[in-house]
């Protein structure tokens, strides 16, 4: 039973589902957004598309109390290859530049939807 | 919030040459197909030029081939149209425009003139 357990347990995510899976967690808080989202709380933006993963993380882990984008930080920390900390600024950000919460959001959701019809799913 | 801000128009001679910016702000810039658009007195809007996101991909109207040049600054946050033998008939408000099919990605500039006439 104990050799039988492996075959139960999940594998690996296949990236394509990981990232199909963080599109539709973006879609459902874009699409249940009554309040401002976050109570308002402002982001560093990303001026740049390669390493674009972590620097969403680490834009996004400094919010902090905000439930509704929890499950999106654990979701991008899965594509981050490193461990990332609040605190962090990425040579990704545009520094003195933020942005809504609610707007880094959709705008993420808009390029995630391009790497996913793009077939980028790394 | 979103904001788009042109600058750069003016009046100039037939046969001269623009450069229009745009500078973005509110939003990830660098992950936005961005264009610019146009509307002469008296007429509809006219697309000009749209550039995609990372910039590799650039689009003209058949109106402006070879005498515009569409680029962007991803680290500026800027949107650029050089713009070179101009004519007459080129004179409009131009305006910078995100230039995205899906909806809701729909944001516009406030616009700049560009005067052509000796």
């Known amino acids: 039973l104990t050799c039988l357990g492996g075959f139960a347990s999940p594998g690996p995510v296949p990236p394509s589902t990981a990232l199909r899976e963080l599109i539709e967690e973006l879609v459902n808080i874009t699409q249940n957004q009554k309040a401002p989202l976050c109570n308002g709380s402002m982001v560093w933006s990303i001026n740049l598309t390669a390493g674009m993963y972590c620097a969403a993380l680490e834009s996004l882990i400094n919010v902090s109390g905000c439930s509704a984008i929890e499950k999106t930080q654990r979701m991008l920390s899965g594509f981050c290859p490193h461990k990332v900390s609040a605190g962090q600024f990425s040579s990704l950000h545009v520094r003195d530049t933020k942005i809504e919460v609610a707007q880094f959001v959709k705008d993420l959701l808009l390029h995630l939807k391009k790497l996913f019809r793009e077939g980028q799913f790394n | 919030g979103v904001q788009l801000l042109e600058s750069g128009g003016g009046l100039v001679q037939p046969g001269g040459s623009l450069r229009l910016s745009c500078a973005a702000s509110?939003?990830?810039?660098?992950?936005?197909?961005m264009g610019w658009v146009r509307q002469a007195p008296g007429k509809g809007l006219e697309w000009v030029s749209s550039?995609?996101?990372?910039?590799?991909?650039?689009y003209y109207a058949d109106s402006v081939k070879g005498r515009f040049t569409i680029s962007r600054d991803n680290s500026k946050n800027t949107l650029y149209l050089q713009m070179n033998s101009l004519r007459a008939e080129d004179t409009a408000v131009y305006y910078c425009?995100?230039?995205?099919?899906?909806?809701?990605?729909?944001?516009w500039g406030q616009g700049t003139l560009v005067t052509v006439s000796s």
């Open positions: 425009a995100t230039a995205e099919d899906e909806p809701g990605y729909d944001y």
């Open positions: 509110g939003f990830i810039f660098a992950w936005y197909d």
């Open positions: 550039i995609n996101d990372k910039g590799g991909k650039t």
